[in-house]
């Protein structure tokens, strides 16, 4: 049998096989050693007994999407049946005091591979034996502690395979420079040691994506905005936009990145080299936000210039093909690629990423201030508590509720919270009365809210003993 017979039903075309050469991977036309690595079809009854105590599940993840040319990393994690784990020696043991269907096990080992390998290696002194090989016959790499690695992982994609010896978790990185754009399938088959042979224990597949567009995400934050995830923000307050570029392999680390913003509110094009930008909308309504991210990334070189005619002088080796960004009104991302040819084939290509959002701008409470605090004299002497009136002003829309949170002087330990609806006039001037139990210093957080906004002000106040002569003090605001 060949690798492709064993590993995959997806058969890439000859073109795909030729143009998607992965560095360090081998062609799936190679022969598979079925004696050492038996092949079971899906539904084969032998799967039931491939692992003591149940089935092993393999979980395959990747940090896809990957910008073409960058590295994509695949991780496989094995999930063992309940109460089983891998120990420091790579053996599979029962967890202490863990009860599964079979109850507590007397034998601490599910698989004691250390003992097996000592018993059955029959090696030739080099540490190498005929069964310490991968399915294609290549010997296991002998780095320190390799004996504790008892799982064999075979990765398969784009008509090629990669073999790896590992523990219950492995990672493989692939450079995507030669990978066709779009979704691709990665399949992994996992075997475990079984004496002098191997037994399949799990198969898993996952789709990954290679793209020529920079994967871009934007987070938006605004002070006083009640719900930051609904893309509704407040007029006349800055919104902070933070651009996150998905680049887990740091492919763009040395690239100059430009962020070209169109906020959709007649502010034209705003270009920045900073991934964060603040923008204030001064109108209510719905606006279309567009971001184009541009990065000069390592990329393919253009074809070499045609050989010169004999009568002409030889052109310089360093030829530059450049086309400049267009700023004409038009769809974002219609800029031609920029290529530069330099002698060592170390060329750059402009890559673009795009983000679009529709954001809604509404009126909101922009600011709240405590302008006065008054100790209210109570008709009945009340030795333990003080009534205090806070006179509060606000800017922006009219609040519908007020909350006060009274806490210790560090503002960390809440003592009580009171919220109540308010009816405020256009001037936005209101009085909030609150009770303080006993003298001392208190932190007061006062918030005014409506449907879309929540504005906060804080102050430290000193409540004196119930001596009419002692004044109320605002410690600081």
């Amino acid at each position: 049998k060949r690798f492709h017979d064993v590993l995959g039903n997806e058969r890439p075309s000859a073109y795909m096989r030729e143009h998607n050469q992965l560095n360090g991977w081998s062609s799936d036309e190679n022969d598979w050693n079925e004696k050492l690595y038996p092949v079971w079809k899906r539904g084969d009854m032998r799967w039931k007994n491939s692992w003591k105590g149940g089935r092993v599940q393999a979980v395959l993840t990747s940090d896809s999407p990957a910008l073409v040319g960058s590295n994509i990393t695949f991780a496989v994690n094995l999930i063992f049946p309940r109460c089983q784990k891998e120990d420091a020696n790579g053996n599979i043991v029962y967890e202490k005091n863990c009860r599964n269907e079979a109850g507590l096990s007397a034998d601490p080992y599910v698989y004691n591979w250390t003992a097996w390998s000592e018993d059955s290696d029959g090696e030739n002194g080099t540490g190498q034996s005929h069964h310490n090989v991968f399915p294609d016959g290549k010997p296991f790499p002998h780095h320190p502690g390799w004996r504790r690695w008892n799982f064999i992982y075979v990765f398969h994609t784009l008509g090629q395979y990669f073999q790896k010896l590992g523990r219950c978790s492995v990672r493989v990185s692939v450079n995507t420079a030669n990978v066709t754009l779009g979704p691709q399938l990665m399949e992994v088959t996992v075997y475990r040691r079984h004496g002098r042979a191997y037994v399949p224990i799990a198969q898993v597949k996952d789709v990954y994506v290679v793209t020529d567009q920079i994967p871009v995400f934007v987070t938006m934050f605004q002070k006083n905005d009640r719900n930051s995830s609904d893309e509704t923000f407040l007029k006349d307050l800055p919104i902070m936009f933070d651009v996150l570029i998905h680049d887990p392999s740091h492919f763009l680390n040395y690239s100059t990145i430009n962020y070209k913003w169109s906020f959709g509110d007649n502010t034209g094009l705003f270009v920045s080299t900073n991934h964060t930008v603040n923008h204030t909308y001064v109108l209510n309504g719905t606006f279309s936000l567009n971001l184009t991210v541009k990065a000069a990334a390592p990329g393919p070189c253009p074809p070499p210039p045609p050989p010169p005619r004999p009568s002409k002088p030889t052109p310089s080796l360093a030829t530059t093909l450049k086309s400049y960004d267009s700023n004409t009104p038009g769809p974002a991302g219609d800029n031609p690629l920029e290529l530069s040819r330099i002698p060592d084939e170390n060329c750059q290509i402009n890559r673009y990423g795009h983000f679009q959002a529709t954001i809604t701008i509404v009126e909101g409470i922009l600011e709240v201030n405590i302008i006065q605090m008054t100790d209210v004299l109570m008709p009945v002497p009340w030795p333990e508590s003080s009534l205090i009136d806070f006179v509060v002003t606000c800017q922006g829309s009219i609040p519908t509720e007020v909350c006060t949170i009274i806490s210790d002087p560090t503002c960390e330990i809440t003592q009580n919270t009171v919220c109540s609806p308010v009816d405020v006039d256009e001037m936005c001037l209101l009085t909030v009365r609150r009770t303080f139990n006993g003298s001392g210093t208190y932190c007061v957080n006062l918030t005014l809210g409506d449907d879309t906004s929540l504005a906060l002000t804080s102050t430290l106040i000193s409540v004196p003993d119930r001596d009419p002569a002692s004044p109320l003090r605002m410690a600081n605001s």
């Epitope: 509110d265 502010t267 603040n278 009104p329």
Partner: antibody, heavy 112, light 107 residues
């Protein structure tokens, strides 16, 4: 290519109104805000206001709030500015402009 | 409203000289400043946006710099065709304002 074609020169009397137009070609009118700018002879540029033709949002320079009214007709790709209660102070060249593009200007003369 | 102030109404220069025109905003406008060129009898033309980015087709002798409240527009080697009035404009909010303009005269 993008072009903004403005209506011809206007000669009118004080107290009347005038409506000038700006026809966009080479792009979709509703994609970009249309701005209007005033320039009196020998003077600088004064921003009057702007309209988003896709939803008719408008914003004005407070100085022109009661003087100018901006409208747009997506079907004909045309933006309009109406100036009312004209005085000699309104005599000027009026430009329409979108991001990076300017019309050739409409000259308004108000004279009795 | 944001006020844009160009301190020099006129600047005199010679062909081949380097000349810089300044503009000050009454409040922080980040880098949201554009520069326009207006030649006699013509509409203005956008040269620079976002403080330092040349608009399509603008020769590279025109550059811009600055952020916050202070901005500079520079012509590295003045040509006769650069005789014009140069206006700064903020595009920080929906409501634009222009500077008063600086007229560049060729000696």
């Amino acid at each position: 290519q993008v072009q903004l074609q403005q209506s011809g020169a206007e000669l009118t009397k004080p107290g009347t109104s005038v409506k000038m137009s700006c026809k966009a070609s080479g792009y979709t009118l509703s994609s970009y805000w249309m701005n209007w700018i005033k320039q009196r002879p020998g003077q600088g540029l004064e921003w009057i206001g702007t309209i988003n033709p896709s939803n008719n949002y408008t914003a004005y320079n407070l100085k022109f709030k009661d003087k100018a009214m901006l409208t747009a007709d997506k079907s004909s790709s045309t933006a309009y500015m109406q100036l009312s209660s004209l005085t000699s102070e309104d005599s000027a060249v009026y430009y329409c402009a979108t991001w990076g593009y300017w019309g050739q200007g409409t000259t308004l003369t108000v004279s009795s | 409203d944001i006020v844009m102030t160009q301190s020099h109404k006129f600047m005199s220069t010679s062909v081949g000289d380097r000349v810089s025109i300044t503009c000050k905003a009454s409040q922080d406008v980040s880098t949201a400043v554009a520069w326009h060129q207006q030649k006699p009898g013509q509409p203005p033309k956008l040269l620079i946006y976002s403080a330092s980015y040349r608009y399509t087709g603008v020769p590279d002798r025109f550059t811009g710099s600055g952020s916050g409240t202070d901005f500079t527009f520079t012509i590295s080697s003045v040509q006769t065709e650069d005789l014009a009035i140069y206006y700064c404009q903020h595009h920080y909010t929906t409501t634009w304002t222009f500077g008063g303009g600086t007229k560049l005269e060729i000696r």
